[in-house]
Interface confidence: medium
């Protein structure tokens, strides 16, 4: 038994052109949450057990409102880890799907609306009890950065959490640094020994004798921060030229770029130029390919011609999506009534209703005049699922709460002056004009001059 832990570091627009707008807006604030689905990586996945190793849902993140004109930043994330407990052996190779969901918090009928923003998938090798593995995945124009690990729950130990190890009261027959393990009396478990001198804080190993550095640290023993200046000590005061007395280890010493990446120094750190198929700070992350088994539900994986899409999944009937991870659109059955918008959330359908309708299928025709008094003597008129007020003279707005300005439409012709009056409006006509709106010119002999019939 053990726990798979996922830590989301950031979710935001990926590099390059076509960066997406923020998923939230000033009009529609929202918050993010994440879902992770795990499957044993070597078995052919059956549609009936989509998350055979388990699944977890994060808490909701902080509410975010887009600032108009500002570029889309990394979005605020939920607190804490996503934890997926597993009862049986950790399989070593596993597949994952991580979904980023948006919860809109506008005042739409029926409460929050949920929509899927991004979904990433891949297959990875991971030994239980090892250090955090970092990953970067892109979905469309979005980029998700995260770390994950699998750890055993005591008394389970080992790379698959299948062996039990517990201290015994009897003196141990194991050598120094080894722990006695049950159920075999004579079996001792050796802790993983990294290269001698490997920094315990900034280095780790997955194989005995190696020393791999955490982000921000470099050098053979992971003791050099990547932002360290190339000079260990400045030249003495007698020196006329600037430079270094003893050349110190530079950020590119020992080439921190993995998988054939080339390193170049930057003013504060270093930068790796990665070969095709790899990315990440040190080119340590490989792009998803067919070898990662990214196609779920029996989808057939074919290598893509485009470098940005290293694989294509051909989905079996009933499934769709870039990883065959979605069931065919059940909204095609048009379950929403009265013009409601259908959303398929995977585990259920959602109808977002037009104003005036409510219910799981927008089946309730709301009595919109009930509890919707029209102010200032207005009367409520229902129609088409929407309410409106027919307002008394001198009032306007949705609920007749606004005092209407009858002069706003400039009703008085020929320079007449408009005055609002409790019963409507009055036009004070300019000399030479008459009528309720000063529309008639006054004839010099006192009769108004009307055009001949």
């Amino acid at each position: 038994a053990g726990v798979f832990e996922l830590q989301i570091h950031s979710f935001g627009p990926g590099p390059g052109p076509g960066a997406p707008r923020s998923p939230c807006s000033a009009r529609l604030p929202c918050r993010l949450f994440f879902r992770v689905c795990l499957k044993p990586g070597l078995s052919e996945e059956a549609a009936e057990s989509p998350c055979a190793l388990g699944a977890a849902l994060s808490a909701r993140g902080p509410v975010y409102t887009e600032q108009p004109g500002a570029p889309a930043p990394d979005l605020p994330l939920p607190d804490g880890l996503l934890q997926v407990p597993f009862r049986d052996a950790w399989p070593g190779t596993f597949s994952f799907i991580i979904e980023t969901w948006r919860e809109e918090l506008g005042d739409q009928i029926g409460g929050p609306a949920w929509s899927l923003l991004a979904r990433v998938a891949g297959r990875r090798r991971l030994a239980a009890g090892g250090p955090w593995a970092r990953d970067i995945q892109r979905a469309g124009a979005w980029e998700l950065r995260f770390s994950y690990r699998a750890r055993c729950e005591p008394p389970a130990v080992g790379t698959a959490c299948t062996r039990l190890c517990r201290p015994r009261s009897a003196p141990s027959r194991c050598g120094p640094g080894l722990r006695p393990c049950a159920p075999l009396e004579d079996e001792c478990e050796a802790p993983l020994v990294c290269r001698a001198g490997c920094s315990p804080e900034h280095g780790f190993c997955e194989q005995p004798g190696e020393c791999r550095c955490l982000e921000g640290w470099t050098g053979p023993l992971c003791t050099v921060p990547v932002s360290t200046s190339s000079c260990l000590s400045p030249r003495g005061p007698s020196s006329a030229t600037t430079g270094c007395l003893v050349p110190g280890p530079g950020p590119c010493d020992g080439n921190p770029c993995a998988n054939g990446g080339s390193c170049s120094e930057t003013p504060r750190s270093f930068e790796c130029t990665c070969p095709r198929g790899f990315y990440g700070l040190r080119c340590e992350v490989s792009g998803v390919t067919c070898a990662d088994g990214p196609c779920f539900n029996g989808g057939l994986c074919v290598g893509g011609a485009d470098p940005d899409s290293a694989y294509i999944c051909h989905c079996p009937p009933g499934f769709q999506g870039s990883n065959c991870e979605k069931r065919v659109d059940r909204c095609s059955l048009q379950p929403c009534r009265n013009g409601g918008l259908c959303l398929d959330l995977g585990h259920a359908l959602r109808c977002r209703c037009r104003a005036g309708f409510a219910g799981p299928r927008c089946e309730h025709d709301l009595d919109d005049c009930a509890g919707r008094a029209c102010a200032n003597g207005g009367t409520c008129v229902e129609g088409g699922g929407a309410h409106r007020c027919s307002c008394a003279l001198g009032f306007g707005g949705r609920d007749c709460r606004e005092r209407a300005d009858p002069c706003a439409a400039r009703p008085c012709a020929h320079g007449g002056r408009c005055y609002a009056h409790f019963s409507g409006l009055v036009c004070a006509c300019a000399p030479g004009y008459m009528g309720a709106r000063c529309e008639f010119p006054v004839h010099p002999d006192g009769a108004s001059a009307l055009p001949a019939a």
């Epitope: 029926g110 409460g111 379950p335």
Partner: antibody
Framework: QVQLVQSGAEVKKPGASVKVSCKAS????????MHWVRQAPGQGLEWMGI????????SYAQKFQGRVTMTRDTSTSTVYMELSSLRSEDTAVYYC?????????????WGQGTLVTVSS | EIVLTQSPGTLSLSPGERATLSCRAS???????LAWYQQKPGQAPRLLIY???SWATGIPDRFSGSGSGTDFTLTISRLEPEDFAVYYC?????????FGQGTKLEIK
């Protein structure tokens, strides 16, 4: 945690009106519909209607049309159900129930119920 | 309106036995919109199953729902003493929402 707390029991005479309240807490009041369901003694459950606390719009079961009025007060996160022209058949426990915070789900949280007795 | 008819009206069983409750609709109901509730005397109903077969939060897996169209079933695989109560089915497919008349599950 989500809580729906209803007002106390009422005894009314035929022809009178009763107004039952349901105070919500532990969630965003305006984000979820509230429904009213009643249950006569020893009988089954009967749906009365729905109110959207966000805008105040309502929909009532045909049987109660013209006699029932559902309102809400967002400042106190309270919904009200008023039933007029009471008759003895209206003697029942009246429940408010929130629509579940699960897509496609139904009432997951209920008030404790308010007994309304109509008797001359 | 959709009329739901539950059967049997009363079911007498012993703890440990399997209970099967039926709910029949007068017209087809989408399985996404059928729920089951449990009600004990003096208490409000408690949601057990929504969407015909999905468990509500905290409901033990001895309760299971199935069915589609006009015929739906609630099954309790092994009855526990606390399961004896009245059970209602409810459709929320079309307005007005309606409930079945209930099935009383009593100890034999």
């Amino acid at each position: 945690q989500v809580q729906l707390v209803q007002s106390g029991a009422e005894v009314k005479k035929p022809g009178a009106s009763v107004k039952v309240s349901c105070k919500a807490s532990g969630y965003t009041f305006t984000s979820y519909y509230m429904h009213w369901v009643r249950q006569a003694p020893g009988q089954g459950l009967e749906w009365m209607g729905i109110i959207n606390p966000s805008g105040g719009s309502t929909s009532y079961a045909q049987k109660f049309q013209g006699r029932v009025t559902m309102t809400r007060d967002t400042s106190t996160s309270t919904v009200y159900m008023e039933l007029s022209s009471l008759r003895s058949e209206d003697t029942a426990v009246y429940y408010c129930a929130r629509v579940a915070d699960i897509v496609g789900a139904t009432f997951d949280y209920w008030g404790q119920g308010t007994l309304v007795t109509v008797s001359s | 309106e959709i009329v739901l008819t539950q059967s049997p009206g009363t079911l007498s069983l012993s703890p440990g036995e399997r209970a099967t409750l039926s709910c029949r609709a007068s017209q087809s109901v989408s399985s996404s919109y059928l729920a089951w509730y449990q009600q004990k005397p003096g208490q409000a109903p408690r949601l057990l199953i929504y969407g015909a077969s999905s468990w509500a939060t905290g409901i033990p897996d001895r309760f299971s729902g199935s069915g589609s169209g006009t015929d739906f079933t609630l099954t309790i695989s092994r009855l526990e003493p606390e399961d004896f109560a009245v059970y209602y089915c409810q459709q929320y497919d079309s307005s007005p929402y309606t409930f079945g008349q209930g099935t009383k599950l009593e100890i034999k």
